[in-house]
Interface confidence: medium
């Protein structure tokens, strides 16, 4: 025997108390699948969150963060304060990266400079709070008789990642 509620489309709920008729979702709620017995309440993008997509009767609202903050967690469940490049966010706010570390983004933590010597290379460009060191060719490559020197690949521009 077919469940009469299976005929209730997205955007409605099947009302047990009214002979299982399909009732539209109440205001500020949605059902993204058919046959539901209740509608989910819409997410509200309040405070530091702002609405990226409005709630409809069949889909939830989507939030992102106001300028100066960035999303964290699945579905932008949290907004975290941005810092400047060369800084990291601590419990006490944005702090400059310690010597020997860098951060080339407005989010995340300061990471240690690359240790060029571990790869048998030399430091071509010193690191800063905002940039990692650039490793050059190994000292052996620079010795007389070495065939050719391949120039180092340019450092990736900060703030850009594959879309």
């Amino acid at each position: 025997l077919q469940d009469p509620c299976s005929n209730c489309p997205a955007g409605t709920f099947c009302d047990n108390n009214r002979n299982q008729i399909c009732s539209p979702c109440p205001p500020n709620s949605f059902s993204s699948a058919g046959g539901q017995r209740t509608c989910d309440i819409c997410r509200q993008c309040k405070g530091v969150f702002r609405t990226r997509k409005e709630c409809s009767s069949t889909s939830n609202a989507e939030c992102d963060c106001t300028p100066g903050f960035h999303c964290l967690g699945a579905g932008c469940s949290m907004c975290e304060q941005d810092c400047k490049q060369g800084q990291e966010l601590t419990k006490k706010g944005c702090k400059d990266c310690c010597f020997g570390t860098f951060n080339d983004q407005k989010r995340g933590i300061c990471r240690p400079w690359t240790n060029c010597s571990l790869d048998g290379k030399s430091v071509l460009v010193n690191g800063t709070k905002e940039r990692d060191v650039v490793c050059g060719p190994s000292p052996a490559d620079l010795s007389p008789g070495a065939s050719s020197v391949t120039p180092p690949a340019p450092a990736r521009e900060p703030g850009h990642s594959p879309q």
Partner: antibody
């Protein structure tokens, strides 16, 4: 037959965390919301939070930082976790099915949790 | 948060009486109000949803009314099994909140 049954530890030491399971039968968690409600001895009902058919949650603002509600649809179980318990968290904890325009049409019998050292 | 107030915490009535239990909200809740009955053993049942809709299986002697901030539950012909505590609950806005309850006793 629609049923909800809470199972909890009974006794919890202060500052410890509480985990309660609500096992449901006769319906699917993908179609109904489940709310948690508690009642301290001799006091009224207090709504703790809800988990929606799609898995989203909402919480009582006073307890939000200590509460977490999750579920396993395939096992027909909903879980309440509360951290940093104090003696005033001693209560009977109920799970209830939310349907229609968000009324609780079926309730579990409740499980009593005592916070004491 | 919306505060729900049941001013009468306990009420004594005789069998056959018509009993009214009131509930008020700290702001308008647009009829988004439910009523629950809790028996002395702790069992909780839904009586009325959306102010005045009778839940299936609930005797017709129970009825609900109200609008704006003021709501009431009426039991038209009190029976022994109605001895219980009655709670109103709003779902106009999250977090959902209950009234403090009204305990009904027999004279």
């Amino acid at each position: 037959q629609v049923q909800l049954k809470e199972s909890g530890p009974g006794l919890v030491a202060p500052s410890q965390s509480l985990s309660i399971t609500c096992t449901v039968s006769g319906f699917s968690l993908t179609s109904y919301a489940i709310s948690w409600v508690r009642q301290p001895p001799g006091k009224g009902l207090e709504w703790l939070g809800v988990i929606w058919p799609g898995g989203g949650t909402n919480y009582n603002s006073a307890l939000k930082s200590r509460l977490s509600i999750s579920k396993d649809n395939s096992k027909s179980q909903v879980f309440l976790k509360m951290n940093s318990l104090q003696t005033d968290d001693t209560a009977r904890y109920y799970c209830a099915r939310g349907t229609g325009t968000w009324y609780f049409d079926v309730w579990g019998a409740g499980t009593t949790v005592t916070v004491s050292s | 948060d919306i505060q729900m107030t049941q001013t009468t915490s306990s009420l004594s009535a005789s069998l056959g009486d018509r009993v009214t239990i009131s509930c008020s909200a700290s702001q308008g809740i647009s009829n988004y109000l439910n009523w629950y009955q809790q028996k002395p053993d702790g069992t909780v049942k839904l009586l009325i949803y959306y102010t005045s809709s009778l839940h299936s299986g609930v005797p017709s002697r129970f009825s609900g009314s109200g609008s704006g901030t003021d709501y009431s539950l009426t039991i038209s012909n009190l029976e022994p099994e109605d001895i219980a505590t009655y709670y109103c609950q709003q779902y106009s806005d999250l977090p959902w909140t209950f009234g403090g309850g009204t305990k009904l006793e027999i004279k």
